[in-house]
Interface confidence: medium
């Protein structure tokens, strides 16, 4: 056996909607032939399934084998280092991977201008891996909310609307002109999931967008 391999110091999930990635930190002084074995346990079925015998990266996409995450009690994963005939002890994720661990995102934000209003429409994520019936709005069917941040470029302000309770919003621009940039962060009021800010979408507002009414 020779010297025993050290275990990966930590193992954790980073997940978005139907994008479930397992990460681990490398063992110290790993060699070019060191690789990592990944196994998965589904709560309620108390046996470990080997997923990958020899991954040379420090992450593994487990989406395909955790498609039922949103209808299950969750998963644990474990990783060990392998080098030839030697292997380390397993390092297990220290929390249950469940729907609560999924970071909420939006697909995109569409902006348009109408009569001096900026109208925003939040597009929900539509990952290719998701089964047809497992849409964002069917899984998070109630209490969807969005924090909205807007800045004006160039300008001298930013502002946030802390909670919009639907996928559409409007902003009366009150005669302001310039480029407006919008970001959105989703949440679900009844859940503790973290949300991630969307990438910024911008739209230019010029005088031509204002109609004069008597």
């Amino acid at each position: 056996h020779g010297t025993e391999l050290p275990s990966p110091p930590s193992v954790w999930f980073e997940a978005e909607f139907f994008h479930h990635i397992l990460h681990w930190t490398p063992i110290p002084n790993q060699s070019e032939s060191t690789c990592y074995e990944v196994a998965l346990l589904r709560y309620g079925i108390e046996s470990w399934n080997s997923i990958s015998n020899c991954s040379q990266t420090l992450s593994y996409d487990l989406t395909a084998v955790t498609l039922d995450l949103y209808h299950s009690n969750g998963y644990r994963a474990r990783v060990r280092a392998v080098d030839g005939s030697r292997h380390s002890n397993w390092t297990v994720t220290n929390t249950r991977f469940s729907v609560d661990e999924v970071t909420l995102t939006v697909g995109s934000v569409n902006l348009e201008i109408h009569n001096g209003f900026i109208l925003g429409k939040i597009q929900l994520p539509r990952p290719k891996m998701a089964p047809a019936n497992d849409t964002y709005e069917s899984i998070f069917s109630h209490f969807r909310e969005y924090e909205i941040a807007i800045r004006k470029v160039p300008g001298n302000f930013t502002f946030t609307h802390k909670k919009v309770k639907h996928e559409n919003f409007s902003l009366l621009t009150s005669g302001e002109v310039g480029e407006f940039c919008v970001q959105v962060k989703p949440s679900v009021a009844s859940r503790s999931n973290k949300g991630m800010w969307s990438k910024e979408e911008c739209i230019s507002l010029t005088r031509q967008y204002f109609t004069v009414t008597n």
Partner: nanobody, 127 residues
Framework: EVQLLESGGGLVQPGGSLRLSCAAS????????VGWFRQAPGKGREFVAA????????YFGDFVEGRFTISRDNSKNTLYLQMNSLRAEDTAVYYC????????????????????WGQGTLVTVSS
């Protein structure tokens, strides 16, 4: 009619924190968008932050850079401005102001949208 009275100003070292309060008299406080402006010596009045009647929307001047938070307690008719990581250039008289209207609108960035003003509280940031 809304009367506004600021408090909490004073001398603070760079990097320090202060919490300003604005007490309102008048039953309609909870229906107003309220905010803070500031006026540095020899300069015009500058928008700092505002918050809508129900706290859903907050507005900030770009110099704030995440250092300040604005909040309100309608049950106490009070507006707050928590100021962290203060800099010498934050030295100014800080005014509390109340606007009319409840639309989510950029009008609240403008001094002219505010009908009611307090007397101001002086914040000095110096070592």
């Amino acid at each position: 009619e809304v009367q506004l009275l600021e408090s909490g100003g004073g001398l603070v070292q760079p990097g320090g924190s202060l919490r300003l309060s604005c007490a309102a008299s008048g039953r309609t406080f909870s229906s107003h968008t309220v905010g803070w402006f500031r006026q540095a010596p020899g300069k015009g009045r500058e928008f700092v932050a505002a918050i809508t009647w129900n706290g859903d929307t907050t507005y900030f001047g770009d110099f704030v850079e995440g250092r300040f938070t604005i909040s309100r307690d309608n049950s106490k008719n009070t507006l707050y401005l928590q100021m962290n990581s203060l800099r010498a250039e934050d030295t100014a008289v800080y005014y509390c102001a109340a606007a009319t209207g409840q639309v989510w609108s950029l009008q609240y960035l403008r001094e002219s949208s505010y009908a009611y003003w307090g007397q101001g509280t002086l914040v000095t940031v110096s070592s």
